[in-house]
């Protein structure tokens, strides 16, 4: 006869471990008992449980309610047991000793491996600003047993670096993702991917990149000279810029206050029916938490009744 077991039994923390021990012998052989023990290099052999063909299962008080036999129907020569709710301290070597009649005793050892799945955490780096050099975008840490794998999944160009710390029963892995911030990265996902044998599928944590920037400002609205004549309605100046965080807009007139009737609506300056008093230098001031930009334009409103004057529109930034 011989014993059938597994060299290694792998179980996830908190699950039940099946410790297999099958006796393959002649049908007329009887299994008297199966003794299960924990083999510790320091503490020696410690009994877990005894499965007796006549008296049933006896469990060491230290493992009370944690060791059980699977319910019937069971092969009478099956000495497998279940170790409930495996913890890291259960990791180690186990021995199954089968006493048979008339063939005698057989023993086999196996190693129980308890996987501790990681609970990853992602920490964003300092605020990203366009114009910075290589900057930490995010770091991702996962601790488990064995050491988890931590990688990054993103379309963004950058560099990753990992370091690990080994603890007595686990290992922590931290991976950092560095990049040179640019506005094109705004809203792009940066995903930390954690792989581990104790996970059914990879764990993924996504961080959305935010890069602070402010684009140059420019003013639109002077392209059609016919709009800027006395009496015309609907003339507007629009300030063009973009930024993160979204910028605020402010309109002023360089050579005095804004004329009455001129309305400011965010990035747009709306004019009432035009008069020559609307001529002047207008300044758009764009700002966010990162920076500010200005753009100015000179508007001259032509009076068609005054033939000596040509339309003269000058734009300057």
């Amino acid at each position: 006869g011989e014993l059938e077991t597994s060299d290694v039994v792998t179980v996830v923390l908190g699950q039940d471990a099946k410790l297999p021990c099958f006796y393959r012998g002649d049908p007329d052989e009887q299994v008297g008992q199966v003794a299960w023990a924990r083999v510790d290099p320091n503490e020696g052999i410690r009994e877990l449980a005894l499965l007796h063909s006549k008296y049933g299962l006896h469990v060491n008080p230290a493992y009370e309610d944690r060791v059980e036999q699977p319910p019937p129907p069971r092969d009478p020569l099956d000495g497998s047991v279940l170790l409930r709710n495996a913890v890291q301290a259960d990791e180690g070597e186990y021995e199954c000793r089968v006493s048979t009649f008339p063939a005698g005793s057989f023993q086999a050892r196996m190693r129980l491996r308890v996987l501790v799945p990681p609970l990853p955490s992602l920490n964003p780096g300092p605020p990203l600003e366009e114009g910075q050099g290589l900057t930490l975008a995010a770091s991702c840490t996962a601790e488990g047993s064995p050491a988890p794998s931590v990688t990054w999944d993103t379309e963004v160009k950058g560099t990753q670096s990992s370091r690990s710390f080994t603890h007595p029963r686990s290992a922590a892995v931290t991976s950092e993702f560095h990049l040179v911030p640019s506005r094109s990265m705004n809203g792009q996902p940066l995903t930390c991917v954690v792989s581990h044998p104790g996970l059914l599928q990879d764990r993924r944590i996504t961080h959305t990149l935010q890069v602070a920037f402010l684009a140059e400002a420019s003013v639109r609205g002077l392209e059609d000279q016919n709009l800027w004549q006395v009496g015309r309605e609907g003339a507007t100046l629009k300030c063009l810029s973009e930024g993160q965080p979204p910028p605020k807009y402010n309109w002023t007139r360089l050579d005095g206050p804004l004329p009455s009737g001129v309305r400011v609506k965010g990035d747009t300056l709306g004019f009432p029916p035009l008069t020559t008093e609307h001529s002047g230098v207008y300044v758009c001031h764009v700002s966010n938490e990162l920076s500010s930009r200005d753009s100015q334009v000179t508007v001259e409103v032509l009076d068609p009744e005054d033939p000596g004057k040509q339309v003269d529109l000058v734009s300057a930034s």
Epitope: K18, P70, P73, D75, P76, D78
Partner: antibody
Framework: QVQLKQSGPNLVQPSQSLSITCTVS????????AHWVRQSPGKGLEWLGV???????DYNAAFMSRLSITKDNSKSQVFFKMNSLQADDTAIYYC????????????WGQGTSVTVSS | DFQVTQSPASLSASVGETVTITCRTS??????LAWYQQKQGKSPQLLVY???TLADGVPSRFSGSGSGTQYSLKINSLQPEDFGTYYC?????????FGGGTKLEIK
């Protein structure tokens, strides 16, 4: 290689018994036991019972009173007998070898299609 | 009474796709679960035992997973020969019931 060949009737009268023989080759019945399973259109796959390598048996409680599984190791044969058949026992009956894990069915017979009718 | 619920009852997929079939049990069965494939007019064939161990000769595109009361069979990159009906079966307490089956049709 491992084979399980079944032999038995295809037609059984109501209230009569059904006997099927499963002859195995490629392994010993002293090393691996055998299951019996049936498949009917109405009930899908149904586990009926098992004979262990040591000769002891376990039956599905629903069939315990009318089912018997025995074997002859020297002839490499497993015998299935079910009494008091009715129309709803019409099914395909399979024998299957117990696998390396001690429970799953890793090789199956070709099946015996049994109709219970007068 | 002990229940084994298999889902879906049927599914249709294309060659190359990945499919997953699930079995739920009414109590913890501690990985005492097997998966079988059956083709029309043929006997079932063992694919996976002990919830996760691939039977001899079964292609690696098949994989079993799960624990406790929930188990899955995954088939990566479906092949034309994978059509048929799939069953799970538990071996925890009597009777060792089968799931109701999942009929997999190739689109």
């Amino acid at each position: 290689q491992v084979q399980l060949k079944q032999s038995g009737p295809n037609l059984v009268q109501p209230s009569q018994s059904l006997s099927i023989t499963c002859t195995v080759s490629g392994f010993s019945l002293t090393t691996y036991g055998a299951h019996w399973v049936r498949q009917s259109p109405g009930k899908g796959l149904e586990w009926l019972g098992v004979i262990w390598r040591g000769g002891s048996t376990d039956y599905n409680a629903a069939f315990m009173s009318r089912l018997s599984i025995t074997k002859d190791n020297s002839k490499s044969q497993v015998f299935f007998k079910m009494n008091s058949l009715q129309a709803d026992d019409t099914a395909i009956y399979y024998c299957a070898k117990i696998g390396y894990d001690g429970y799953a069915m890793d090789n199956w017979g070709q099946g015996t299609s049994v109709t219970v009718s007068s | 009474d002990f229940q084994v619920t298999q889902s879906p009852a049927s599914l249709s997929a294309s060659v190359g796709e990945t499919v997953t079939i699930t079995c739920r049990t009414s109590e913890n069965i501690h990985n005492y679960l097997a998966w079988y494939q059956q083709k029309q007019g043929k006997s079932p064939q063992l694919l996976v035992y002990n919830a996760k161990t691939l039977a001899d000769g079964v292609p690696s595109r098949f994989s079993g997973s799960g624990s406790g009361t929930q188990y899955s069979l995954k088939i990566n990159s479906l092949q034309p020969e994978d059509f048929g009906t799939y069953y799970c079966q538990h071996f925890w307490s009597s009777p060792w019931t089968f799931g109701g089956g999942t009929k997999l049709e190739i689109k």
